[in-house]
């Protein structure tokens, strides 16, 4: 996260660390007791390591109560994801067993009704990506609010050039912003899950870049079917 | 840029023995599962051995048609990917290939292959 | 083992035709974690094969959308909607949800 700040210990209780071999890899976010919603293109250089997801953290590094590391049964990424676009970024991941759930550790409702968020609406997205260009990883979860921008902005030559489909929408990114190592972490309007951080190698922090995100709720029937 | 490049093919007598090597370059070699796929002349292709990463304990697979007679193995020090290949018979001629193995996917990157042919 | 068998042999099509390829399984290929490793081959002449589609239908970076993939169960198909000269070669299903892993024997596309 990009010019923002540390979050409240534990008040993102949806808050997931994608891993690979122990280190933080993506964001994520427990959509259900036994199921954390990331980004496919995340695991496309998990290569043969080992996927697993923490949920109840503050500290990556730092011992808490609340912690615990579950272990993947099942990686279910979008049927149409491909590794060369940005589009259906999405990706399911059952943990071995139901989450144990409390305080913070809490499933985040996500949005089903397929309408775009209102442009300027601010929306909080938190993660343990990089939090400078240099590329300084944040050992404690950050967050940002960031302002929804209207798709044909979004979409202009200058900006992301009409890559933005109906299923994506836009946040401003002007010295604030979603990074590497965010994909895959929740973008929240008005405590409901709206996106998800894609996982391009996308510049961060210049504002005729704006932050992509995936929209949840054009994707309702594909998790629902998943989670089914 | 990925690259595999395989070596060590080559003229072997039945029964005798050969090592392949696969030097890779260009990615963390480390995290990836590798294989060796193999074609016989004017053949398909037909997956021979696999063997998983460090973190997933060096698990190797063979083929039934391989079993007992040919080793994968890896040094990770050295990104370098290995054959044994022992007992060879003239069912065993065909180009090799080292092969990487993707995440959601196979067989992403292969090498040019080598060739070993066993005959007396 | 699985035995994955490909039909037909051989496929000889004119440019700008469609092509399309089968490959049935000789047992469900549905893996442990519910996914279903198949996937699809190019072995152009002289060179090494090149992934095209995986986990039945979805198209590796750099393929056109000219190449599907569908299927379930123990039945798949590849199908190409407007074959080009560079598409002309020897094609491979591939299931790897089970060990051993097996290709299929491989269909020739040729032209007619």
């Known amino acids: 996260i990009l010019g923002g700040r540390e979050a409240e210990a534990h008040a993102r209780p949806y808050m997931a660390s994608v891993q690979v071999n122990g280190e933080h890899l993506c964001g994520g976010v427990l959509v259900a007791e036994q199921w954390v919603l990331s980004a496919a293109h995340c695991l496309e250089d998990a290569a043969d390591g080992k996927v697993q997801v923490l949920l109840g953290a503050h500290s990556l590094s730092q011992p808490e109560p609340s912690k615990r590391l579950y272990d993947v049964l099942r990686a279910v990424p979008h049927p149409d994801s491909r590794p060369d676009t940005i589009d259906h970024d999405l990706l399911l991941l059952q943990l071995s067993e139901k989450a144990t759930l409390g305080p913070a550790v809490r499933p985040l409702p996500w949005q089903r009704v397929d309408r775009d968020v209102e442009p300027g609406t601010l929306c909080d997205v938190a993660g343990w990506g990089i939090v400078s260009h240099a590329g300084r990883r944040p050992d404690r979860l950050q967050h940002v609010l960031l302002p929804v921008l209207d798709r044909a902005t979004c979409n202009r030559r200058t900006h992301h050039d009409g890559a933005i489909t109906q299923r994506m929408m836009c946040a401003e990114s002007n010295r604030r912003d979603s990074c590497k190592g965010d994909s895959g972490g929740p973008l929240v309007c008005g405590g409901v899950l709206e996106g998800v951080v894609t996982s391009g190698s996308r510049v961060c922090g210049n504002r005729k870049k704006p932050g992509i995100y995936t929209r949840v709720a054009s994707y309702a029937a594909w998790i629902d079917s998943v989670l089914a | 840029e990925v690259q595999l490049v395989e070596s060590g093919g080559g003229l072997v007598q039945p029964k005798g023995s050969l090592k392949l090597s696969c030097a890779a370059s260009g990615f963390s070699f480390n995290t990836y599962a590798m294989n060796w796929v193999r074609q016989a002349p004017g053949k398909g292709l037909e997956w021979v051995a696999r063997?998983?990463?460090?973190?997933?304990?060096?698990?190797?697979y063979y083929a039934d048609s391989v079993k007992d007679r040919f080793t994968i193995s890896r040094d990770d020090s050295e990104s370098m990917l290995y054959l044994q290949m022992n007992n060879l018979k003239t069912e065993d001629t065909a180009m090799y290939y080292c092969?990487?193995?993707?995440?959601?996917?196979?067989?992403?990157?292969w090498g040019t292959g080598t060739t070993v042919t066993v005959s007396s | 083992d699985v035995l994955m068998t490909q039909t037909p042999l051989s496929l000889p099509v004119s440019l700008g035709d469609q092509a399309s390829i089968s490959c049935r399984s000789s047992?469900?290929?549905?893996?442990?974690?519910?996914?279903?490793?198949l996937e699809w081959y190019l072995q152009k002449p002289g060179q090494s094969p090149k992934l095209l589609i995986y986990r039945v239908s979805n198209r590796f970076s750099g393929v056109p959308d000219r190449f599907s993939g569908s299927g379930s169960g123990t039945d798949f198909t590849l199908k190409i909607s407007r074959v080009e000269a560079e598409d002309l070669g020897v094609y491979y299903c591939f299931q790897g949800s089970h060990v051993p892993y097996t290709f299929g024997g491989g269909t020739k596309l040729e032209i007619k």
């Open positions: 092969v990487r193995h993707g995440y959601y996917w196979y067989f992403d990157v």
């Open positions: 063997i998983r990463s460090k973190s997933n304990n060096y698990a190797t």
């Open positions: 047992q469900s290929i549905v893996h442990s974690d519910g996914n279903t490793y």
